[in-house]
């Protein structure tokens, strides 16, 4: 299981990771006490047939070729968590791990 | 974390979970010994902002739009395996369990 | 760059109520806590309480409880510190301090930009 | 509430010299202690958090070391301006408490 990192910089096409740190602060989101931003990454690039694909369901479903598949797309496939201090809804002050909140890896799917 | 189910005849254009059965038979997958076919299920439609995202990042890449980011396409978010018998390359036979090979759910990231 | 200034020096009568600002520059105002630390003349730093801007969120040292109320106003990026029922033991050097966090646990941070200080003198 | 005993309350030292400043906290405090430098009139600077992180800009010859309850400040060679009031807080717990301070002077 791999996938491609690439920066501003890169010519690359296909579906590659690229950098991204997410500032909340400029969001305005100040009901996140920290981290004030974090390095998220995003995913961005072509599907060609087979490249980086995650699952054999995504090959089985493109030689069956249904009505209305658009054919992979390039998103995360790896992904992790983040540790955050934020209140909630009811002003309390909560500490947790938030999932999913950092891209690790990009395939097609 | 929920999913919407769609069939051939729903006039549903967001993304949703369809039924689909892969026919290893009609492919020319004879390696494959058993099952012959199996119900795979795919994802499709369209993923307007915030509608069925699996993620709390597809909303922060959405907020931060960075150069080349698409936006989130519909794609599995919850996959199941099935158990399968097959030849492998050495011709020996193999039973075992073959994750990500049905779609139970589908979402926008 | 980050600053914090505070309202001049104050002279109070005893049983009289002050009301000390500080001005926040440089930053987000609402998504740092501001602290309030004061010192008599002479001695050590004794924490007051803090507030969070964004949504007025306040936390006091239960010897100022009673007394002593945070509040900001978040069009002018001021935080004020409400001290009443003033006695003269209230003599001291009132500082606001923004808190910085470096890490995400609820204690991983540091003051890292200080008030220059008020003065408050509590004299009949 | 944490009390913070920091000890000495003074001390008299000569440009050049190592010196080190302890403080101890009533309870475990998990290496939640900080470092300030007052100098008269102004207002206190942070110097060192969590306990031996430095903060930007302080130069090096200052370091914190120290865990559960016994915690120290070391200046390594001091200079004429690091002659000042030093304190530790522990950050731990509500309500944040400070030790009462040591004064360096020069000797």
């Known amino acids: 299981d791999f996938g491609l990192d690439c920066d501003e910089h890169s010519t690359e096409s296909r579906c590659c990771r690229y950098p991204l740190t997410v500032d909340f602060e400029a969001f305005g989101w100040d009901w996140i006490i920290a981290p004030k931003r974090y390095k998220a990454n995003y995913c961005s690039g072509e599907c060609e047939f087979v490249f980086l694909q995650k699952y054999p369901h995504t090959h089985l479903v493109h030689q069956a070729n249904p009505r209305g598949s658009a054919g992979p797309c390039c998103t995360p496939t790896k992904m992790s968590p983040i540790n955050m201090l934020y209140f909630n809804g009811k002003e309390q002050i909560i500490y947790g791990k938030i999932p999913a909140m950092v891209v690790d890896r990009c395939g097609c799917s | 974390d929920f999913g919407l189910d769609c069939d051939e005849h729903s006039t549903e254009s967001r993304c949703c979970r369809y039924p689909l059965t892969v026919d290893f038979e009609a492919f020319g997958w004879d390696w494959i010994i058993a099952p012959k076919r199996y119900k795979a299920n795919y994802c499709s439609g369209e993923c307007e902002f915030v509608f069925l995202q699996k993620y709390p990042h597809t909303h922060l890449v959405h907020q931060a739009n960075p150069r080349g980011s698409a936006g989130p396409c519909c794609t599995p978010t919850k996959m199941s395996p099935i158990n399968m018998l097959y030849f492998n390359g050495k011709e020996q036979i193999i039973y075992g369990k073959i994750p990500a090979m049905v779609v139970d759910r589908c979402g926008c990231s | 760059q980050v600053q914090l200034v505070q309202s001049g020096a104050e002279v109070k009568k005893p049983g009289a109520s002050v009301k000390v600002s500080c001005k926040a520059s440089g930053y987000s105002f609402t998504g740092y806590f501001m602290h309030w630390v004061r010192q008599a003349p002479g001695q050590g730093l004794e924490w007051i309480g803090n507030i969070y801007p964004y949504n007025g969120v306040s936390n006091y040292n239960q010897r100022f409880k009673a007394r002593a109320t945070l509040t900001v106003d978040k069009s002018t990026s001021t935080a004020y510190m409400e001290l009443r029922s003033l006695r003269s033991d209230d003599t001291a050097v009132y500082y606001c301090?923004?808190?910085?966090?470096?890490?995400?646990?609820?204690?991983?941070?540091?003051?890292?930009?200080w008030g220059q200080g008020t003065l408050v003198t509590v004299s009949s | 509430d944490i009390q913070m005993t920091q000890s000495p309350s003074s001390l008299s030292a000569s440009v050049g010299d190592r010196v080190t400043i302890t403080c101890k906290a009533s309870?475990?405090?998990?290496?939640?202690l900080s470092w300030f430098q007052q100098k008269p009139g102004k207002a206190p600077k942070s110097l060192i958090y969590r306990a031996n992180r430095l903060v930007d800009g302080v130069p090096s010859k200052f370091s914190g070391s120290g865990s559960g309850q016994d915690y120290t400040l070391t200046i390594s060679s001091l200079q004429p301006e690091d002659f000042a009031t030093y304190y530790c807080?522990?950050?731990?717990?509500?309500?944040?408490?400070f030790g009462q301070g040591t004064k360096l002077e020069i000797k």
């Open positions: 309870q475990d405090i998990n290496s939640y």
């Open positions: 807080l522990q950050s731990d717990e509500f309500p944040l408490t």
């Open positions: 301090a923004r808190r910085y966090y470096y890490g995400t646990g609820p204690a991983d941070w540091y003051y890292d930009v």
